[in-house]
Amino acid sequence: LYFSRDAYWEKLYVDQPAGTPLLYVHALRDAPEEVPSFRLGQHLYGTYRTRLHENNWICIQEDTGLLYLNRSLDRSSWEKLSGRNRGFPLLTVYLKVFLSPTSLREGECQWPGCARVYFSFFNTSFPACTSLKPRELCFPETRPSFRIRENRPPGTFHQFRLLPVQFLCPNISVAYRLLEGEGLPFRCAPDSLEVSTRWALDREQREKYELVAVCTVHAGAREEVVMVPFPVTVYDEDDSAPTFPAGVDTASAVVEFKRKEDTVVATLRVFDADVVPASGELVRRYTSTLLPGDTWTQQTFRVEHWPNETSVQANGSFVRATVHDYRLVLNRNLSISENRTMQLAVLVNDSDFQGPGAGVLLLHFNVSVLPVSLHLPSSYSLSVSRRARRFAQIGKVCVENCQAFSGINVQYELHSSGANCSTLGVVTSAEDTSGILFVNDTKALRRPKCAELHYMVVATNHQTSRQAQAQLLVTVEGLYVAEEAGCPLSCAVSKRRPECEECGGLGSPTGRCEWRQGDGKGITRNFSTCSPSTKTCPDGHCDVVETQDINICPQDCLRGSIVGGHEPGEPRGIKAGYGTCNCFPEEEKCFCEPEDIQDPLCDELCREQKLISEEDLGGEQKLISEEDLHHHHHH
């Protein structure tokens, strides 16, 4: 048995006479032989579920579900209840109604075995019948909505009449009907005004019925019509077996370059017309088991269940359904030497499915794991300026297909043929398994005899000790010009184009910082800034070379605070900035401020912003004072 609603609403007035009928609650059957028996909870509740008083006023007919006033609720009773409502005005009280046989303990009230009946209380006597508007004569203030389980016996789930109105205003005639299309499974009995289902409902055919209830009021010669929505929702049960969309029960996959733990190797989709079990229970009740194979397979793969609600068309309306994606996932990184082919089977069981038929499917995955060979081009040729600063990125080396690699560890090394000309370093980029070549020793660059640098690039997979090698020829170009004395270590410090371009900084391939002119479009990724190389900094990503020293590209790598209009990077740096952004790496601070506008008002605002920043910086104890910044701003 279950209630057709989880909440009912009616009005209560002071001194309404004992015996006044209030409303009917309705229970629907889960099985044909069930007979409902209704029971009221012992207490009345107020605001915030405050228990107000034992219920001495309202009774229920156990067999019919009729609630009625056993005794009149007088003003003094009402004041007593109000006094217990935690100081809130008592506007609404509620009772719990239980369906027997349910637990006799009055605890939480949860549908389907319990419903709440809310009474809106009016501190006046019942109004004169002639003063009631048609809407008040026809329907409760709160519009009802109904829930009916699919595949259950038909039954009565609503009664239209407002019983207190009928009882206290017998001279007013009220008639009801349901507007519904042809062939809908509901009827409204003209005499009893009871609404019932004609037959068992099927949620997979239709899930929602948006009916309209029509009420016609006759008072003397006057006739008025009131219409309200009358929505019915069909509740699901697990009556559909899982199936394969288009009959596809097998997926084939090749594991080659993507060998990282958690890589999705292949996916098979299962369709279920049901939307139960509910999401909280789904993974527990809708099980998937990788059928036992060899130990290697069990250790290497796992199956992940990803259910998703979808909607499908049925009889011209959309109903919800579930698609279950079963992903075959790598449980560990695979060695590049691994080479095998296997068939895996996954048993899917919709354990709540009651039949007919079986709620079990078998999924098949055919997987080939191919070995990966390390290959480098026969040689690389690059050039570097004698003026390049330390950490300047001058190129990349990459084993064949390295951009496609994941879960494959490749370490790059440089072996120099001339010990005194060992200028470059290499670091492996975690993103694409390439090796970034950078200037590590600027002194060697200046030596006249180091005009050509010869290296051997060695790429190694340490897990298998597999290697690849290539020659690297680096031509050193240009004349050495001494670093400018008095210039900052970091290009990012400079806030104006002229001062940016007159200095070099860490990471600069040309020995000069580069100015990136922003687009001036508010808080933008393309903010103006001074960079060692606009190819790599800022690009919203703190790369493996930039991590070596915060002075290279604080715009991408700073973990400190950013003052002014900006969007922080994830997990660090400036994702987007307003105007010009400059940074003081040792202060762990960046400032994003409007481009220079010769406007006194703006100037004052900027000044205020700087003052705020200055407090943030800790006053005179820090490297940057407000005046420094302010005058710098106008330089």
Epitope: P488, R496, C500, P585, E586, D628
Partner: antibody, heavy 121, light 107 residues
Framework: QVQLVQSRDEVKKPGASVKVSCKAS????????ISWVRQAPGQGLEWMGW????????NYAQKVQDRVIMTTDTSTSTAYMELRSLRSDDTAVYFC??????????????WGQGTMVTVSS | DIQMTQSPSSLSASVGDRVTITCRAS??????LAWYQQKPGKVPKLLIY???TLQSGVPSRFSGSGSGTDFTLTISSLQPEDVATYYC?????????FGQGTKVEIK
């Protein structure tokens, strides 16, 4: 607070060497270079040279370049200026000075307190 | 090397007077000129950098102007505490030469 603290005054004989230290505090030592400036009694300021505290690169004034060596010890945030083959006209107050990294080239806004080196037989 | 020449080498003025010191570079140095104040027995103090930008904490009666080869330091209203020697310095490239200094006294 940003400051440069120099070693105590020295008295040296002609032909000897002197090594003056300059300890930086309140900032990251490698973020800006240190210059050395001297001032003979009653005379003006004379720039002697500059060291890049990050990589050790140096630039020396022509007048002293054969006799001066500027070095740093980043572990102690200290810069050193060694002047060899001292003569009586090397008697002066020796200052270390730095420019805060506020973008572009900068003048000296931080100075050590000075070290008096007297060369006398 | 670029030479820096200051004039006058000394001057005497009354409190409240407007004082002007000039500095000439033997070749163009753009705006890379600084002015320092040194009081007797004290450390030099930066007043102006980039030819015209007032250093933080320096009174606004000090101002700088010029670009290229000719530069000026002006004290709009001389105060007793301004008695000192003033030096210009170029810093566009090494060597960072100083001028020979201008000694300012109160009449």
């Amino acid at each position: 607070q940003v400051q440069l603290v120099q070693s105590r005054d020295e008295v040296k004989k002609p032909g000897a060497s002197v090594k003056v230290s300059c300890k930086a505090s309140g900032y990251t030592f490698t973020t800006y270079g240190i210059s050395w400036v001297r001032q003979a009694p009653g005379q003006g300021l004379e720039w002697m040279g500059w060291i890049n505290t990050y990589n050790g690169d140096t630039n020396y004034a022509q007048k002293v370049q054969d006799r001066v060596i500027m070095t740093t010890d980043t572990s102690t945030s200290t810069a050193y200026m060694e002047l060899r083959s001292l003569r009586s006209d090397d008697t002066a107050v020796y200052f270390c000075a730095g420019a805060r990294p506020l973008g572009g080239r900068r003048a000296f806004d931080i100075w050590g307190q000075g070290t008096m080196v007297t060369v006398s037989s | 090397d670029i030479q820096m020449t200051q004039s006058p080498s000394s001057l005497s003025a009354s409190v409240g007077d407007r004082v002007t010191i000039t500095c000439r570079a033997s070749q163009g140095i753009s705006h890379y000129l600084a002015w320092y104040q040194q009081k007797p027995g004290k450390v030099p103090k930066l007043l102006i950098y980039a030819a015209s930008t007032l250093q933080s904490g320096v009174p606004s009666r000090f101002s700088g102007s010029g670009s290229g080869t000719d530069f000026t330091l002006t004290i709009s209203s001389l105060q007793p505490e301004d008695v000192a020697t003033y030096y210009c310095q170029k810093y566009n490239s090494v060597p960072w030469t100083f001028g020979q200094g201008t000694k300012v006294e109160i009449k």
